[in-house]
Interface confidence: low
């Protein structure tokens, strides 16, 4: 079948990195600069992606594969194939339309991207708070009082104290 197809369509003989040039009697011509063909039998080469502005080049374009972009420092990729770059924030912050904002009290973000998430509610699992949460870290839940052996000192949940100067938003 392949042999028959190639007799009927001479373009099928053109390998990746070339295109079937109708203007030159269907000769396989190399892709021009800044273009590529990742499969054989192509009648045109695709224009290479250019990593501009906030995008930077992770992999250069070759005649057989497109360029791949990532983001300049301070930004991270979003979307398939890094179609967008979004500004990084610090841990303990989230990105809003007005820039990076501190997580509200009772929430945390341990990454430079994404949104602030509520602290784990230890009591839902019948556990107590072993370590307080912060803007950057979730609470650590400890064993429930029932899990403690008789005579052992129970773990008292510390009272949640506001961080100095940090008001809820």
């Amino acid at each position: 079948f392949e042999r028959t197809r190639s007799l009927q369509d001479p373009c099928s003989n053109c390998p990746a990195g070339t295109f079937c040039d109708n203007n030159r009697n269907q000769i396989c011509s190399p892709c021009p600069p800044n273009s590529f063909s990742s499969a054989g039998g192509q009648r045109t080469c695709d224009i290479c992606r250019q990593c501009k502005g906030v995008f930077r080049t992770r992999k250069e374009c070759s005649s057989t594969s497109n360029a791949e972009c990532d983001c300049t420092p301070g930004f991270h990729c979003l979307g398939a194939g890094c179609s967008m770059c979004e500004q990084d924030c610090k841990q303990g912050q989230e990105l809003t339309k007005k820039g990076c904002k501190d997580c509200c009290f009772g929430t945390f973000n341990d990454q430079k991207r994404g949104i602030c998430r509520p602290w784990t509610n230890c009591s839902l699992d019948g556990k107590s708070v072993l370590v307080n949460g912060t803007k950057e870290r979730d609470v650590v839940c400890g064993p429930s009082p029932a899990d403690l052996s008789p005579g052992a000192s129970s773990v008292t949940p510390p009272a949640p104290a506001r961080e100095p100067g940090h008001s809820p938003q």
């Epitope: 906030v54 300049t72 301070g74 979003l78 770059c85 979004e86």
Partner: antibody
Framework: QVQLKQSGPGLVQPSQSLSITCTVS????????VHWVRQSPGKGLEWLGV???????DYNGAFISRLSISKDNSKSQVFFKMNSLQADDTAMYFC??????????WGQGTTLTVSS | DIVMTQSPSSLAVTAGEKVTMRCKSS????????????LSWYQQKQGQPPKLLIY???IRESWVPDRFTGSGSGTDFTLTISNVHAEDLAVYYC???????????FGGGTKLEIK
């Protein structure tokens, strides 16, 4: 810390060319683009062109026929060349780092006077 | 090319006053994909290169005091300086940097003078 240092001539004759080197430190040219901007005496800022981190360039259409920007990543140098200079090209020329959303660090500027 | 129009071209204020300057673009600088406005503000003092003040229309650079506020979206943008200090004496430029609309262009500048 991040720095961009420019070197180039101060006086050029009409019809001659201008070459400026922008040597950067504190960051890699494989991670950031570098723009060129000029400022004529008493006037505002005019964007001339850019070389992106991957090596591709974009130019202001008004200068595309006589402007060339290139770079040497290993030497952390960006090269700016403008041909066919006339008196109205007299200006301060700056290189500046692209940070995505703005030009966050600028060179000290190269003063060019085009005069015979 | 996108045309950036700044107003007023100059203004003189007394230290401590509030100042508002405007920048209007001939095309929208709002990118619907990420809701970012590709507009920056620069401050240029006499004999110095410009300094990036605000990007994304409203996000202050780390060195910028919070008396500087950028606002606006689409085609209309504002830079406000509340409680002007003597060291704010400078020319302020807006610039579009939407990569889909090359060339990047700057406004004509607003010169801030202190009485």
């Amino acid at each position: 810390q991040v720095q961009l240092k420019q070197s180039g001539p101060g006086l050029v004759q009409p019809s001659q060319s201008l070459s400026i080197t922008c040597t950067v430190s504190g960051f890699s040219l494989t991670s950031y683009g570098v723009h060129w901007v000029r400022q004529s005496p008493g006037k505002g800022l005019e964007w001339l062109g850019v070389i992106w981190s991957g090596g591709s360039t974009d130019y202001n259409g008004a200068f595309i026929s006589r402007l060339s920007i290139s770079k040497d990543n290993s030497k952390s140098q960006v090269f700016f060349k403008m041909n066919s200079l006339q008196a109205d090209d007299t200006a301060m020329y700056f290189c500046a780092r692209d940070r995505g959303g703005g030009f966050d660090y600028w060179g000290q500027g190269t003063t060019l006077t085009v005069s015979s | 090319d996108i045309v950036m129009t700044q107003s007023p071209s100059s203004l003189a204020v007394t230290a401590g006053e509030k100042v508002t300057m405007r920048c209007k673009s001939s095309q929208s600088l709002l990118w619907s994909v990420n809701q970012n406005n590709y507009l920056s503000w620069y401050q240029q003092k006499q004999g110095q290169p410009p300094k990036l003040l605000i990007y994304g229309a409203s996000i202050r650079e780390s060195w910028v005091p919070d008396r500087f506020t950028g606002s606006g979206s689409g085609t209309d943008f504002t830079l406000t300086i509340s409680n002007v200090h003597a060291e704010d004496l400078a020319v302020y430029y807006c610039q579009h940097n939407h990569g889909s609309f090359l060339p990047y262009t700057f406004g004509g500048g607003t010169k801030l003078e202190i009485k």
